[in-house]
Interface confidence: medium
């Protein structure tokens, strides 16, 4: 891990896994004040490669319900509403970072997992393969 | 706040402001694989709305290094390779949880914190303002 | 999809307290949280706390501070808001609402209320 | 906290016409303007959440639109089911806070 100088101010920990399990303060639930980002988009409709939100539900995870984008065309969306399969729509995918309960049911231990997400699709060139 | 059946085998927490701080175990479970987004696809090189990947880091943060997406083009790529400004190409942005030392340099104690990153990028039909 | 099912109409006296459960059903309790809800008669909607499931954190209205406790009993996925000091202002019905928190187009945590229960009517007179 | 402000406090509206109900927060609060309506004893209902996203099972009349200080609730066509009172609701900054109410009846 890091070498970090130990502060004195700095809480103590004794388990033997240190620095593996930590102290996390969850406070990101504190709405109180008009910094957070603001949602935009409704990207996902005015897009040429659009996508629709499905629903990924896991009561032992934070956050326990999921959007994942799926592309609704396998080509993209043209001037004229039509869609052009000359080109891709394709998912842009993203790691987050989510808490999972663990143990099971305890209701104040955590494990942090990694999780690939789709956020929204982007409409690309295909790659062609020329056979020889 | 909410009542959990106890178990046995769950950590027990005596601080104050419980349940705002947890206990969170770091060794990450990872339920996918390529983490450096240039590895990941070329999508940002082929999309119709390109964009570039900038490094952002921080040692007091966890990730300590996030890829940000930038736009290339106000405009969207057409077939030619000309951009059509008729188009708009925007950024996919997503909030991630990072972790926060907190207090700073302290190397078992965090704030969970929520961060907005531009993912990639999509083509958009432009939101048309009519004067009356 | 999730139903909300609350206990009936309370009549009380002023300066004792009031508490409505608000039953759920359907989707898992721990996906979401339930946020307290109130209409004067006659009036608008004011919101008075709410409570994350997922890690138990409750948030309150800084008017209703003090007098409001919001608790659930994930065993029973029962919600429950408990006010005290009751006075002739309070009157009102009192709703529970569904808030998603859910990961959804991009951002953490969702906030707009989805599904509400019937309402409680509660009225304090003398 | 944040104040909403609905506009017109009351309509009468004859059927198929178009409704428009505007919506002002005193801050910028991006996309996070919710609409309900509510019918006379029932609990309110969503309709559109984040500003212009729809609700399945919400009829297609019912489009919203705007973001970080205004914000619009439209009925296209309006249906004699529609009578109700509508509210805005904003998420942004806890406390949530709601408009006053926009009542609409049918002529």
């Known amino acids: 891990g890091i070498a970090i100088p130990r502060n004195s101010g700095c809480p103590n920990s004794e388990d033997k896994n240190f620095p593996r399990t930590v102290m996390v303060n969850l406070n990101i639930h504190n709405r109180n004040t008009s910094t957070n980002p603001k949602r935009s988009s409704d990207y996902y409709n005015r897009s040429t490669s659009p996508w629709n939100l499905h629903r990924n539900e896991d009561p032992e995870r934070y956050p326990s319900v999921i959007w994942e984008a799926k592309c609704r065309h396998l080509g993209c969306v043209k001037a004229d509403g039509n869609v052009d399969y000359h080109m891709n729509s394709v998912p842009i995918q993203q790691e987050i970072l989510v808490l999972r309960r663990e143990p099971r049911h305890c209701p104040n231990s955590f494990r942090l997992e990694k999780i690939l997400v789709s956020v929204g699709c982007t409409c690309v060139t295909p790659i062609v393969h020329h056979v020889a | 706040g909410i009542a959990i059946p106890r178990n046995s085998g769950c950590p027990n927490s005596e601080d104050k402001n419980f349940p705002r701080t947890v206990m969170v175990n770091l060794n990450i479970h990872n339920r996918n694989t390529s983490t450096n987004p240039k590895r990941s696809s070329d999508y940002y090189n082929r999309s119709t709305s390109p964009w570039n990947l900038h490094r952002n880091e921080d040692p007091e943060r966890y990730p300590s290094v996030i890829w940000e997406a930038k736009c290339r083009h106000l405009g969207c790529v057409k077939a030619d390779g000309n951009v059509d400004y008729h188009m708009n190409s925007v950024p996919i942005q997503q909030e991630i949880l990072v972790l926060r030392r907190e207090p700073r340099h302290c190397p078992n104690s965090f704030r969970l914190e929520k961060i907005l990153v531009s993912v990639g990028c999509t083509c958009v039909t432009p939101i048309v303002h009519h004067v009356a | 999809e999730v139903q909300l099912v609350q206990s009936g109409a309370e009549v009380k006296k002023p300066g004792e307290s009031v508490k409505i459960s608000c039953k759920a059903s359907?989707?898992?309790?721990?996906?979401?949280?339930i946020s307290w809800v109130r209409q004067a008669p006659g009036q608008g909607l004011e919101w008075m706390g709410g409570?994350?499931?997922?890690?138990?954190?409750?948030d309150y209205a800084q008017k209703f501070q003090g007098r409001v406790t919001i608790t659930a009993d994930e065993s029973t996925t029962t919600a429950y808001m408990e006010l005290s000091g009751l006075t002739s202002d309070d009157t009102a019905v009192y709703y529970c609402?569904?808030?998603?928190?859910?990961?959804?187009?991009?951002?953490?945590?969702?906030?707009?209320?989805?599904?509400w229960g019937q309402g409680t009517t509660v009225t304090v007179s003398s | 906290e944040i104040v909403l402000t609905q506009s017109p406090d009351f309509q009468s509206v004859t059927p198929k016409e178009k409704v428009t109900i505007t919506c002002r927060a005193s801050?910028?609060?991006?996309?996070?303007l919710h609409w309900y309506q509510q019918k006379p004893d029932q609990s309110p209902k969503l309709l559109i959440k984040?500003?212009?996203h729809s609700i399945s099972g919400v009829p297609s009349r019912f489009s919203g639109s705007g973001s970080g200080t205004d914000f619009t609730l439209t009925i296209n066509g309006l249906e004699a089911e529609d009578a109700a009172t509508y509210y805005c609701?904003?998420?942004?900054?806890?406390?949530?806070?709601f408009g006053q109410g926009t009542k609409v009846d049918i002529k």
């Open positions: 609402a569904r808030e998603p928190n859910d990961f959804w187009n991009g951002y953490y945590d969702t906030h707009d209320f989805d599904s």
């Open positions: 984040y500003a212009s």
């Open positions: 409570i994350t499931h997922f890690f138990g954190i409750t």
């Open positions: 609701h904003q998420s942004d900054t806890l406390p949530h806070t």
């Open positions: 359907g989707g898992s309790f721990r996906s979401y949280g």
């Open positions: 801050q910028n609060i991006g996309s996070e």
